[in-house]
């Protein structure tokens, strides 16, 4: 059964102090991922018992395995049905608590009734505040039966339900006619799916004989132990104040489990903790009684004393539930109540016994659920005990169930049943998932859905190049972490498979399905170097760079130029898609802006190392273009340009720049400065004869302005080849601005 407990704090003087806590002892409970089970849910169930709406209740989670409901403002908030849901998948289980108002007209003598299929159930509602009206019985909120108020017997209204069947299970209530439903007595009836002592699909299997008030589960034959007891048959008492399937939980507060109601998975229902009784679980057991609701009687023999939490405490030399067994009778020692093995393993099981006469190897045997008897292969004899070792044949799923170790001597016999769980090693149902890839590594999420049993203890990732016959490489990883496969080959497909393991020998499952994961291109290793840049306008920048000359092909598809405008916090990226390019013109930039510039080689989606950055200041916007530019040939090597000053100047012109280019030529244009801004004409000298030239010009104030119209003119005659154009020498310093 699922280890799930719903605790109700019944100290009801102040509803605001009332709380419900749901505690799960399941491994990984409430972690919230599909692989590890959904979270615990704790809520009020208003489908049958509805109460007036109030402020919403507060749900607080304490870690993954505990959830608490608080925020009850008035007593009526408490009345009704609460449920906690926990466990994963097929083990998902609902635990139900039914709360009655202490001030109700009718109160249940006993809230939870667990009966067997075919039994007669009797629900008893005790009159607390009498009304001389009929009593209506309801089942799951629907009308069921009416009793005349005269029919009360000894101040109680009884509802007899003969030959109950599982569909009869549910919430029953007894209410005076025309009284508030909140004054009802609420009951919970749990009908096991089998007759007494039986379990299984056809009720053919025999229950293990649950002790101390444990209830045999009709589906799996396990004992659902009362709070405060543990073991396959609930044979062991927990220390005072402890509960949970392994006694791992502790009651809160200094008074231990006093005032707490414990609800467990069906078919147990609810009860007080061990050692307590009463409607509010605040009364200690009377002498001679112990256990949950003090339902058990000690009847200790041979000088044993009764402990209200654990039952008989035997004096030296005696043992057994009632101290009825002499220590001379053989006794099985320290047998685990539950063992877990993996499918198809051949485990060794030990069984130790003591007694007088001393047990020997042949006197200890092991019986499987199908009745097969195994004899021990080896025995270790020590002064105080004999330990028999059994070599179990290869386990199959049918070996799950109750095994029994039996010792027989002339002094008597003893046996101990224990549960063997045969677990199926996990097998991945899907391939691992690729998260990121680089040229030499793949980052993989290995945890996938799986068939078989958890928990997952290790994850192995097996990988090798696609279509390779080489051995698989294996990496063992933590189940909850992503895995990095390193030192791979670039641009290579790898077949990757997951293998999951659960704890214990033989816990390794089969390999999961393969998936193909491909590494990225090789990273570009070369770092470009910015070699120069020049401003071609207020919004245009020509950039040039170099790459080291290296042997072999260039690993790269192109270049990425990045311009960072720190003032505005903006980045501009320019892609140059040829790896042979060494220059680029960047246009549409913001005049007057300080940019940081760098360049990177790229290959596929990978960026190489960046060049050291350069800092470039674009000039602010310049003046308008000069007007009416005109060209006139003067000789075979001279052309005169005339123009008019630009209109609407924002300030005094510092110079003019003339651009000269041979018409149809492929070379870069030449720029010539006119440093006397008051001039409106200049002569360009040193031109080639009979050659057609293109001219345009612009003014500069702080930054260069717009270009004028372009004019064409040819030089005259058949002169000699000139060295190159220059402007007429009329200013102190003239020259080229490249």
């Amino acid at each position: 059964a699922v280890d799930l407990t719903l605790l109700a704090n019944l100290r009801l003087t102040d509803p605001q102090r009332f709380f419900l806590t749901c505690v799960s002892g399941e491994a990984g409970a409430g972690r919230g991922s599909d692989a590890w089970g959904p979270p615990l849910l704790l809520e009020k169930d208003d489908r049958i018992v509805r109460t007036p709406p109030g402020p919403p209740l507060r749900l607080a989670r304490n870690g993954s395995h505990q959830v608490t409901l608080r925020g009850f403002s008035k007593p009526s908030d408490l009345v009704g049905v609460f449920s906690c849901v926990g466990g994963a998948g097929a083990r998902r289980t609902r635990v139900i608590y039914v709360h009655n108002s202490p001030g109700a007209h009718l109160l249940p003598d006993k809230v939870t009734h667990t009966v067997n299929k075919g039994d007669t159930a009797v629900l008893s509602a005790r009159v607390h505040k009498e009304k001389q009206t009929d009593v209506i019985w309801k089942s799951n909120g629907s009308y069921f039966y009416t009793l005349d108020w005269h029919e009360a017997q000894d101040g109680r209204f009884l509802l007899q339900l003969p030959n109950v069947q599982p569909p009869s299970s549910g919430i029953y209530s007894a209410t005076y006619l025309e009284a508030s439903p909140l004054g009802s007595a609420f009951f919970r009836l749990i009908v096991r799916g089998c007759g007494a002592g039986r379990w299984g699909p056809g009720c053919t299997k025999e229950c293990p004989g649950c002790l101390h008030g444990g209830v045999c589960h009709d589906h799996d034959g396990e004992c659902v132990c009362p709070p405060g007891f543990t073991g396959t048959r609930c044979e062991q008492a927990c220390r005072e104040g402890r509960f949970g399937q392994s006694c791992q939980e502790q009651c809160p507060g200094i008074s231990g489990c006093r005032g707490l109601t414990f609800c467990l998975p069906d078919p147990y229902g609810c009860s007080c903790g061990s050692g307590w009784r009463g409607s509010q679980c605040q009364e200690a057991c009377a002498p001679g009684h112990f256990g949950a609701d003090c339902r058990l009687q000690c009847q200790c023999q041979n000088g044993g004393t009764c402990d209200r939490f654990s039952g008989c405490v035997c004096p030296s030399g005696w043992h057994g539930v009632h101290c009825e067994k002499s220590d001379r009778i053989p006794q099985i020692l320290n047998m685990a109540s539950e063992l877990e093995f993996n499918l198809e393993t051949m485990p060794r099981i030990n069984c130790a016994a003591a007694g007088n006469p001393f047990p020997v190897r042949g006197s200890i045997e092991l019986r499987k659920p199908d009745g097969t008897v195994l004899l021990s292969t080896k025995a270790i004899v020590e002064p105080e005990k004999t330990t028999a070792e059994f070599e179990v044949p290869r386990l199959v799923l049918a070996d799950s169930g109750f095994w029994e170790c039996r010792v027989s001597t002339s002094g008597g016999q003893d046996s101990r049943r224990f549960k063997v769980n045969v677990k199926v090693p996990p097998v991945p149902l899907a391939a691992p998932r690729l998260l990121t890839k680089q040229s030499r590594q793949l980052v993989v999420s290995p945890l996938v859905s799986f068939s078989g049993d958890g928990p997952i203890s290790t994850v192995r990732l097996h990988y090798r190049p696609q279509d390779s016959t080489m051995d698989w490489s294996t990496i063992v990883v933590d189940p909850s972490e992503n895995v990095t496969l390193m030192n791979l080959r670039p641009k290579t497909g790898y077949s990757v498979r997951v293998q999951l393991s659960r704890p214990g020998e033989g816990g390794e499952g089969a390999w999961g399905p393969p998936t193909l994961m491909t590494t990225d291109c090789p990273e570009p290793l070369l770092q470009p170097w910015l070699e120069g840049w020049h401003v071609e306008g207020t919004d245009r920048l020509r950039v040039s760079w170099s790459l080291p000359l290296v042997p072999g092909p260039l690993v790269g598809d192109g270049f990425l130029l990045r311009l960072w405008d720190g003032t505005r916090g903006q980045e501009r990226r320019e892609n140059v898609s040829s790896p042979q390019a060494r220059t680029a013109l960047l246009t549409g930039l913001t005049p007057g802006t300080h940019y940081q510039l760098d360049v990177q080689l790229y290959h596929c989606t990978l960026l190489g190392p960046a060049s050291p950055p350069a800092h470039v200041l674009l000039p602010p916007s310049g003046p308008p273009a000069p007007r009416h530019l005109h060209a006139q040939a003067l000789s075979d090597s001279e052309i005169q340009l005339t123009w008019k000053h630009p209109e609407a100047l924002p300030g005094p012109i510092s110079k003019y720049v003339v651009e000269v280019q041979v018409a149809g030529g492929a070379g870069d244009p030449l720029w010539i400065d006119v440093d006397r801004p008051e001039e409106t004409s200049t002569i360009i000298r040193g031109l080639n004869a009979s050659t057609r030239y293109l001219f345009r010009m612009r003014a500069s104030i702080q930054g260069l302005g717009d270009w004028s119209n372009t004019v064409e003119e040819s030089t005259l005659g058949n002169g000699l080849q000139a060295e190159g154009p220059v402007q007429e020498s009329r200013a102190a310093e003239e020259g080229l601005d490249q």
């Epitope: 030499r440 290793l525 070369l526 000359l549 960046a610 060049s611």
Partner: antibody
Framework: EVQLLESGGGLVQPGGSLRLSCAAS????????MIWVRQAPGKGLEWVSV????????SYADSVKGRFTISRDNSKNTLYLQMNSLRAEDTAVYYC????????????WGQGKMVTVSS | DIQMTQSPATLSLSPGERATLSCRAS??????LAWYQQKPGQAPRLLIY???NRATDIPARFSGSGSGTDFTLTISSLEPEDFAVYYC?????????FGLGTRLEIK
């Protein structure tokens, strides 16, 4: 044999200037980017400045920007670091190093020159 | 700027043992990471470049691995001459930065 040999270190007062040289031999100096790295006494390594193979582009660490100038003379196979407005925190061993073509790491280092800035 | 964090700061081992030095970048540097060895009074010496490539004349006992933000330098079997300070350095973006170093000392 491929090697780098620094010269020009020494003691200088705060605010003073110093010029370090690094003579390269055994490889084609003009094809390699070069770098200066320094190491304060008992401390780790810190990049100072870098220069492209042609000398057309330089870059500096923020801590020296505006005070130090890197340059090279490819015809003399020599790298320089001009250090002005020196401060006490510039006290360190200065190394010149060659930057690999592939891998971009610093594969050849000079022996280092101590620069002490103190009054 | 990219910060480089080396761990441990000091590693005490005996000759013949295996040394594992770690370097972590504050953001991805792809594979653009180098390792250097420096002995007292000497210039650094390049051991590994681009995360896993051994430099010229470096013995095979030195190996590098990792990419992105986490890198490892492994010395498979320590020789007496391997006791020194080791630095990692990224060149993914400027300014290039070094780790503070791991001192490998004889136990």
């Amino acid at each position: 044999e491929v090697q780098l040999l620094e010269s020009g270190g020494g003691l200088v007062q705060p605010g003073g200037s110093l010029r370090l040289s690094c003579a390269a031999s055994g490889f084609t100096f003009s094809q390699y980017p070069m770098i200066w790295v320094r190491q304060a006494p008992g401390k780790g390594l810190e990049w100072v400045s870098v220069i492209s193979p042609s000398g057309g582009h330089t870059s500096y660490a923020d801590s020296v920007k505006g005070r130090f100038t890197i340059s090279r003379d490819n015809s003399k196979n020599t790298l320089y670091l001009q250090m002005n407005s020196l401060r006490a925190e510039d006290t360190a061993v200065y190394y010149c190093a060659r930057i690999q073509y592939y891998g971009g790491a610093f594969d050849i280092w000079g022996q280092g020159k101590m620069v002490t800035v103190s009054s | 700027d990219i910060q480089m964090t080396q761990s441990p700061a000091t590693l005490s081992l005996s000759p013949g043992e295996r040394a594992t030095l770690s370097c972590r970048a504050s953001q991805s540097v792809s594979i653009y990471l180098a390792w250097y060895q420096q002995k007292p009074g000497q210039a650094p010496r390049l051991l590994i470049y681009d995360a896993s490539n051994r430099a010229t004349d470096i013995p095979a006992r030195f190996s590098g691995s990792g990419s992105g933000t986490d890198f490892t330098l492994t010395i498979s079997s320590l020789e007496p001459e391997d006791f020194a300070v080791y630095y990692c350095q990224q060149r993914s973006s400027w300014p290039i930065t070094f780790g503070l170093g791991t001192r490998l000392e004889i136990k």
